[in-house]
Interface confidence: medium
């Protein structure tokens, strides 16, 4: 339904508060280095312009597309060339090329200072002094660091952020009330950002068909009582929402997400019995709740899949007439019966089925050819099951920190060319799969673990894409979205790697390590571990363990010393010498 003025349409649909917040997110995700004040100024100008269009949709420029309006506004930034370099060339292009150009310059790892949390009293004072600016600053800081953050979901986080300050700044013990809430928001926010980044990578690198297949599988698991046509409807609408958000069309995305939540709640009887509570909540909470809702119970007495997809004489006919619909039905039927499988496993099974039909439907006796297709699924199912079993046993044996270290060593040996900070970040996140998923019963372990690993490995892929250094990473990241994890799992030690030159400076530590949080101290030690492996890729587990134990003892000893700095200098030299001897460096 065409509107005379798109900007007026979205302003009226979303309301001024959400409109301003979403425009701020959009601008901060595009121009990640711009100061907060500059973005606020641009947002206010756009908002005032939108209001004139609401008053008169025929007013000058009101008929322009949102990309044109927003792009024109971004291109007024005076320091564009100095701050962003070649990104300024985007402004010489016309829409839609200009927006595509801005999208290509989004930086997953912007060179921005780490967000340091001020004292609670300082934060509460800032919150009370100017609540609106305080919350805008939150949106800005998150959006510029996470340029693909799901914008309507960021509004939900901001609402929770505001609620935390409203409650806790009045509490007797402000810190005890506020800090755990902020920690929870930070951790959930990082997870939400990474999950959305995978959705955008799926759409942008592998296309709409890949995203739709993922969505069919996931929604069929979640809504197993819904008809195939209903699932297809939801998939179509969900794909539109995520395509818009990943493409920077945040106003349309938020608007369409609200429409989708409304549709789901109006039709919950034909979708899922688990939606009732979600649908009673306000809009932002409702959308979030629907996205996280538990799987509905599977319908009783579902017939065997073999009848329609293997035994039927019409398999090749049905496939030939509408390949994607038939494969969609197969994926739907398989997924609704298997909430215990990961989405990526279900997609591998569907791909195997498709490949078999492509081959067999051209054969002399198609039925004979595809009759055993389900037997081909067995090894595909067993591979992740076995991997998860082994790694959960290892996690239970080692605990999270040491499990992360085992993965650090494993992945550094596989892809030693990758930067140390990336290896540390990715391996730490891979290691979190243990505490996140191993506690679950068997039936929930695989969807938890393998789909989480897909999200983490995508982080590796997007960070590596910025500065590619390893052909092996590029290969695993680009060949197949659903086979990324098996591809990385199958990598052995990189025999072509030339060990890094030993640099004593890398292993020189100072007294400041003693004041770090436990997490930061772990990261320092894990950074050293990665560097050790890069110097000595053939080092055994035992050798590495010995050196790391010595290192931990050294840090503990010097942090207890009266003259910490002297201890670190003197004992550090001894540790480096001992480590070199132990590893034969």
């Amino acid at each position: 339904d065409a509107h005379k003025s798109e900007v007026a349409h979205r302003f009226k649909d979303l309301g001024e508060e959400n409109f301003k917040a979403l425009v701020l997110i959009a601008f901060a995700q595009y121009l990640q280095q711009c100061p907060f004040e500059d973005h606020v100024k641009l947002v206010n100008e756009v908002t005032e312009f939108a209001k004139t269009c609401v008053a008169d949709e025929s007013a000058e420029n009101c008929d322009k597309s949102l990309h044109t309006l927003f792009g024109d506004k971004l291109c007024t930034v005076a320091t564009l060339r100095e701050t962003y370099g070649e990104m300024a060339d985007c402004c010489a292009k016309q829409e839609p090329e200009r927006n595509e150009c801005f999208l290509q310059h989004k930086d997953d790892n912007p060179n921005l200072p780490r967000l340091v949390r001020p004292e609670v009293d300082v934060m509460c004072t800032a919150f009370h002094d100017n609540e609106e600016t305080f919350l805008k600053k939150y949106l800005y800081e998150i959006a510029r660091r996470h340029p693909y953050f799901y914008a309507p979901e960021l509004l939900f986080f901001a609402k929770r952020y505001k609620a935390a300050f409203t409650e806790c700044c009045q509490a007797a013990d402000k810190a005890a009330c506020l800090l755990p809430k902020l920690d929870e928001l930070r951790d959930e926010g990082k997870a939400s950002s990474a999950k959305q980044r995978l959705k955008c990578a799926s759409l942008q690198k592998f296309g709409e068909r890949a995203f739709k297949a993922w969505a069919v599988a996931r929604l069929s698991q979640r809504f197993p009582k819904a008809e195939f046509a209903e699932v297809s409807k939801l998939v179509t609408d969900l794909t539109k929402v995520h395509t818009e958000c990943c493409h920077g069309d945040l106003l349309e995305c938020a608007d369409d997400r609200a429409d989708l939540a409304k549709y789901i709640c109006e039709n919950q009887d034909s979708i899922s019995s688990k939606l009732k509570e979600c649908c009673e909540k306000p809009l932002l909470e409702k959308s979030h709740c629907i996205a996280e809702v538990e799987n509905d119970e599977m319908p009783a007495d579902l017939p065997s899949l073999a009848a329609d997809f293997v035994e039927s004489k019409d398999v090749c006919k049905n496939y030939a007439e509408a390949k994607d619909v038939f494969l969609g039905m197969f994926l739907y039927e398989y997924a609704r019966r298997h909430p215990d499988y990961s989405v990526v496993l279900l997609l591998r099974l569907a791909k195997t089925y498709e490949t078999t039909l492509e081959k067999c439907c051209a054969a002399a006796d198609p039925h004979e050819c595809y009759a055993k297709v389900f037997d081909e699924f067995k090894p595909l199912v067993e591979e992740p099951q076995n991997l998860i079993k082994q790694n959960c046993e290892l996690f239970e044996q080692l605990g999270e920190y040491k499990f992360q270290n085992a993965l650090l060593v494993r992945y550094t040996k596989k892809v030693p060319q990758v930067s140390t900070p990336t290896l540390v970040e990715v391996s730490r996140n891979l290691g979190k799969v243990g505490s996140k998923c191993c506690k679950h019963p068997e039936a929930k372990r695989m969807p938890c673990a393998e789909d989480y690993l897909s999200v983490v490995l995508n982080q590796l892929c997007v960070l590596h894409e910025k500065t590619p250094v390893s052909d092996r990473v590029t290969k695993c990241c680009t060949e197949s979205l659903v086979n990324r994890r098996p591809c990385f799992s199958a990598l052995e030690v990189d025999e072509t790697y030339v060990p890094k030159e030993f640099n004593a400076e890398t292993f020189t530590f100072h007294a400041d390590i003693c004041t770090l949080s436990e997490k930061e101290r772990q990261i320092k030690k894990q950074t050293a571990l990665v560097e050790l492996v890069k110097h000595k890729p053939k080092a055994t587990k035992e050798q590495l363990k010995a050196v790391m134990d010595d290192f931990a003892a050294f840090v503990e000893k010097c942090c207890k010393a009266d003259d910490k700095e002297t201890c670190f200098a003197e004992e550090g030299k001894k540790l480096v010498a001992a480590s070199q001897a132990a590893l034969g460096l």
Epitope: E227, F228, A229, S232, N267, S270, A307, D308, S312
Partner: nanobody, 119 residues
Framework: EVQLLESGGGVVQPGGSLRLSCAAS????????MLWVRQAPGKGLEWVSV????????YYADSVKGRFTISRDNSKNTLYLQMNSLRAEDTAVYYC????????????WGQGTLVTVKS
């Protein structure tokens, strides 16, 4: 009792157009996905197009994509199929049906309307 009544078939020249209608009763039409299927003389059933209860999304068999358009009017409990650029191979009896709840089986059928494309 579920009833589906197709109409609009006839004889048309290649390149011509026809609009089929299907009047539905006896079930809640606006919560049911619907489809058109066809059966050419001496051939098996071939599905043509599916439409969701809300009107989107729609799906088409590769053989009719770009030429046929499925639509519905929930207020009139009616399903439509606009057929343009008709070809000889489109000659068939066209049936409207209630979309299968999950498996490749169709719940309810009409009696069909014959479309003949010949010069």
């Amino acid at each position: 009792e579920v009833q589906l009544l197709e109409s609009g078939g006839g004889v048309v020249q290649p390149g011509g157009s026809l609009r089929l209608s299907c009047a539905a009763s006896g079930f809640t039409f606006d919560t049911s996905s619907m489809l058109w299927v066809r059966q050419a003389p001496g051939k098996g059933l071939e599905w043509v197009s599916v439409i969701h209860q809300s009107g989107t999304p729609t799906y088409y068999a590769d053989s009719v994509k770009g030429r046929f358009t499925i639509s519905r009017d929930n207020s009139k409990n009616t399903l439509y199929l606009q057929m343009n650029s008709l070809r000889a191979e489109d000659t068939a009896v066209y049936y409207c049906a209630k979309f299968p709840s999950s498996r490749m089986k169709f719940d309810y059928w009409g009696q069909g309307t014959l479309v003949t494309v010949k010069s």
